[in-house]
Interface confidence: low
């Protein structure tokens, strides 16, 4: 039942004498394992015997394999799947049909495979893409319908007989679907490859030539051009003639149009291979080329730089940079169209030639105000000298110069005056637009550059102004030298260092912090009475009567200033003590009598002691001694003693007389 046998293998295999053939093959016998296999060469079915006749190249039975042809033919298969065969070496007479006779327990099958063995190695086949264009990458393929494990080969690419540098990728296939060896080469052909021969060479493992295939490359490219010019250096003078010729060295396909370009722009009505320029002008200087097109695109020649020589044109001056800041660097550039380029320059500043300046550029490293003005130049080349152009203006900017602060007032200035100052300067570029003053104050600027200080302070020492354009220039500070009456006048005790005691030597100093002018007079005053005109007031031996409120005055030509009143305090022991009696020195018994100890003391008495006519101290220590009720026995002389921090003082005796009351007398 034929439907039960399924085979897969290449339909035809190719080889040459002495090579080998590898036949990949698979099968499926559904009713069981293979029991017998015979490989026939050109089998033919014999109807009489119901068997196949032909040369048996290989045979295997249940009893085992039968060696045939000294192992030239090998069955590499198995009993149920693989039917791969190898013939090594293969001979010319192996060409024809191979018959695989397969038998299982119940089924038989003859499978036929074609074998084509040539006398010599057959050539590979080169495959090219349908169109090749310059600079576009293409893949060249070399295919050979042969591959065998026992016979290694190689494919090599040659261009005009020389091995190609590009790396080729070789692949082989030995499958039931196909058997081949393939080499692929990627490369980017140039226009110069057009018409060249490419060869794919088949070699054995040792590199020995076996066969080859060749193709001629058809590389499509834009026209390749050459330009020729007369005169050959393309340097002419105004009025001369110039001829340019365009030659096509290669074009595939043929060219269709011709044109000429100058500086990238097409020249009208110039559509031949020759360009004639008669009586050229300097405007015709530039880069020329010819352009020829074909179906691939336009091709351009190299550029020819036509130089039409002429004397320098009127020059202009470029300044980097104007306006310039004083002290900065400035560069002047003389610009003049000329061919050849000028070799010599003459520079002018405000119409006067600048000595030693012959270069295209003039560099001034440090600009000063006097550099300002008009700069012009003249350029010169081998054909002549140009004209002087209009020139360029250099504006040199600088801060205001020689700034001074000027006091407008008559001198001297007195405290409280209104002072007017002006800010003057010698020159400025750009113009002064504002002024600044130091120190800052809430002062008026009635007009630009004028400062008005109303009610000027005694301590306004110096003022400086700045005149400002883009920069500020400060003047040296000017001293206002404000005159004022003496300040901070005060009385200061020089001696003694501690408190003043009666009898001490005392010195008072009249101090002041400042005075302008310095020449001063002093006055001492107590209670409106003038005491002295020195800076010091001296007491050889101070008395309590000297205590009081003292002031000193200091005056100068501007005015006088008084100190605050200063209180002079004299400390002394209690004095002028006396005992006063109330209601009087004669009191009736039974009434009340108060004795008071009166004194003069600084500091006041802190402690009183009372004594009787026997100089006996009484147990009373307050200023008042109260006797209530008074008795006749209280009659007698009393005195008191006062004590302060300085010392003690005592009163004279004062007699108290206590007389009997009428009641007492009545009882007697």
């Amino acid at each position: 039942d034929s439907s039960k046998w399924v085979f897969e293998h290449p339909e035809t295999l190719y080889a040459w004498e002495g090579a080998c053939v590898w036949i990949p093959c698979t099968y499926r016998a559904l009713d069981g394992d293979l029991e017998s296999f015979i490989l026939f060469h050109n089998p033919e079915y014999n109807k009489n015997t119901s068997k196949f006749d032909g040369t048996r190249l290989y045979e295997s039975t249940k009893d085992g394999k039968v060696p045939s042809e000294q192992k030239r033919v090998q069955f590499l298969g198995d009993k149920n799947k693989n039917c791969t065969l190898s013939i090594h070496p293969v001979h010319l007479n192996d060409s024809g049909q191979l018959g695989l006779r397969m038998e299982s327990k119940t089924e038989k099958w003859m499978e036929r495979i074609h074998l084509n063995v040539s006398e010599r190695p057959f050539p590979p086949h080169i495959q090219l893409p349908p169109e090749i264009q310059e600079s576009q990458e293409v893949t060249l393929t070399c295919l050979l319908n042969f591959s065998c494990y026992g016979y290694p080969i190689q494919l090599q690419w040659l261009l005009e007989g020389v091995p190609m540098r590009q790396a080729a990728v070789t692949s082989t296939s030995l499958t039931i679907k196909s058997v081949f060896t393939r080499s692929e080469l990627k490369f980017s052909p140039q226009w110069s490859h057009h018409g060249k021969i490419v060869t794919c060479q088949l070699q054995d493992a040792d590199g020995k030539f076996l066969s080859n295939d060749t193709v001629q490359l058809n590389v499509k490219h834009t026209p390749k051009l050459e330009i020729k010019v007369t005169p050959s250096d393309a340097i002419v003078r105004e009025g001369d003639s110039v001829t340019m010729t365009c030659e096509v060295s290669s074009s595939n396909p043929e060219y269709t149009t011709v044109s000429w370009l100058k500086d990238g722009t097409s020249l009208k009505k110039q559509n031949t291979f020759t360009l004639n320029l008669r009586e050229v002008t300097k405007d015709q200087s530039g880069k020329y080329c010819c352009q020829v097109s074909n179906d691939v695109g336009p091709g351009r020649s190299e550029e020819v730089f036509l130089q039409v020589q002429y004397a320098p044109e009127p020059s202009t001056v470029q300044i980097l940079h104007s306006p310039a800041v004083e002290g900065s660097q400035v560069e002047f550039l003389c610009m003049s169209l000329a061919n050849p380029l000028p070799t010599n320059y003459t520079w002018y500043h405000n119409g006067k030639e600048m000595q030693g300046r012959t270069e295209e550029k003039v560099h001034i490293p440090k600009i000063l105000p006097w550099h300002a003005g008009t700069y012009s130049c003249v350029a010169e080349n081998i054909l002549g000298t140009g004209q002087r152009g209009p020139g360029a203006e250099l504006d040199v900017q600088y801060p205001p110069k020689k700034v001074t602060t000027v006091i407008q007032n008559p001198m001297p200035i007195r405290e409280g005056d209104t002072v007017t100052l002006s800010c003057n300067y010698n020159s400025s570029n750009p113009s002064v637009t504002r002024y600044e003053w130091k120190p800052h104050g809430a002062w008026e600027e009635p007009s630009l550059g004028v400062l008005k200080i109303q009610n000027v302070g005694w301590d306004n020492t110096t003022i400086a102004c700045a005149a400002c354009n883009s920069w500020c220039s400060w003047a040296s500070p000017v001293a206002l030298n404000v005159q004022y009456a003496p300040r901070d006048v005060r009385v200061r005790k020089i001696k003694p260092l501690s408190e003043i005691h009666s009898g001490n030597s005392v010195s008072l100093q009249c101090d002041f912090s400042s005075s302008h002018p310095k020449e001063v007079q002093f006055f001492w005053e107590k209670n409106g009475r003038l005491l002295g005109k020195e800076s010091q007031l001296n007491f050889d031996s101070i008395s309590p009567e000297d205590a009081g409120s003292y002031s000193c005055w200091v005056n100068n030509s501007i005015g006088q200033t008084a100190s605050k009143a200063w209180t002079l305090e004299v400390l002394y022991a209690p004095r002028r003590l006396r005992v006063s009696m109330s209601p009087g020195d004669q009191v009736m018994e039974g009434k009340s009598a108060t004795l008071t100890c009166e004194s003069d003391a600084n500091p006041p008495v802190s402690h009183y002691t009372w004594f009787d006519w026997n100089n006996q101290s009484l147990p009373y220590h307050s200023q008042k001694l109260r006797l209530e009720p008074v008795k006749v026995q209280h009659s007698g002389a009393y005195w008191c003693q006062g004590t302060n921090s300085v010392g003690k003082g005592r009163s004279p005796l004062s007699t108290l007389t206590v007389y009997y009351s009428p009641e007492t007398i009545g009882r007697r």
């Epitope: 637009t433 800052h440 104050g441 809430a442 109303q454 302070g457 301590d459």
Partner: antibody, heavy 116, light 108 residues
Framework: QVQLVQSGAEVKKPGASVKVSCKAS????????ISWVRQAPGQCLEWMGW????????SYAQKFQGRVTMTTDTSTGTAYMELRSLRSDDTAVYYC?????????WGQGTLVTVSS | EIVMTQSPATLSVSPGERATLSCRAS??????LAWYQQKPGQAPRLLIY???TRATGIPARFSGGGSGTEFTLTISSLQSEDFAVYYC??????????FGCGTKVEIK
């Protein structure tokens, strides 16, 4: 050295007034003006006005005209800024600065919070 | 009134990198421009006045430039203490002053 010391933080109700003081030392008070600048939380600096310590002349920002009064007391070297009819958006730190155009010396700032 | 516009509002920079802050005036203020630095909870600190003059005690890495209407503050190599808000202020119309709304320089 120059110092500007401002009064402490204040909490006010909407519609009330606040008076911030700025005591100057280390320089002649009369010779310089005082600028007032405020900064609401997370906001930009906002110039409010200027007063001359010399003659009391003032210049107020348009926004605060009629609501702000700036004064000085030359005897104590103190500048004052009073802001009336307070609103919640007046909550800010108020700075005084010695005004020379470029404020080199600033007070430490006074936080005024306006909240009902 | 002269309006001062600062850009960008926020600038993220790594320590050691250069920072350039811009300030534009709505009309020319000549060179009468100051730059301040303000850190949270502190009063502004003067960095630059006169557009390009460093105030006393300000490190040389801070530099100011420009005049007229376009100004820049450049911090050549940012230190950790430089991360703050920077304000420009014109005093061309002194005593009337106007401030920009600030550029916050933050750590990248």
């Amino acid at each position: 050295q120059v110092q500007l010391v401002q009064s402490g933080a204040e909490v006010k109700k909407p519609g009330a007034s606040v008076k911030v003081s700025c005591k100057a030392s280390g320089y002649t008070f009369n010779n310089y003006g005082i600028s007032w600048v405020r900064q609401a939380p997370g906001q930009c600096l906002e110039w409010m006005g200027w007063i001359s310590a010399y003659n009391g002349k003032t210049s107020y920002a348009q926004k605060f005209q009629g609501r702000v009064t700036m004064t000085t007391d030359t005897s104590t070297g103190t500048a004052y800024m009073e802001l009336r009819s307070l609103r919640s958006d007046d909550t800010a730190v108020y700075y005084c600065a010695r005004s020379t155009g470029d404020g080199e010396y600033w007070g430490q700032g006074t936080l005024v919070t306006v909240s009902s | 009134e002269i309006v001062m516009t600062q850009s960008p509002a926020t600038l993220s920079v790594s320590p050691g990198e250069r920072a350039t802050l811009s300030c534009r005036a709505s009309q020319s203020v000549s060179s009468n421009l100051a730059w301040y630095q303000q850190k949270p909870g502190q009063a502004p600190r003067l960095l630059i006045y006169g557009a390009s003059t460093r105030a006393t005690g300000i490190p040389a890495r801070f530099s100011g430039g420009g005049s007229g209407t376009e100004f820049t503050l450049t911090i050549s190599s940012l230190q950790s203490e430089d991360f703050a808000v920077y304000y420009c202020q014109q005093y061309h119309t002194w005593p009337v002053l106007t401030f920009g709304c600030g550029t916050k320089v933050e750590i990248k």
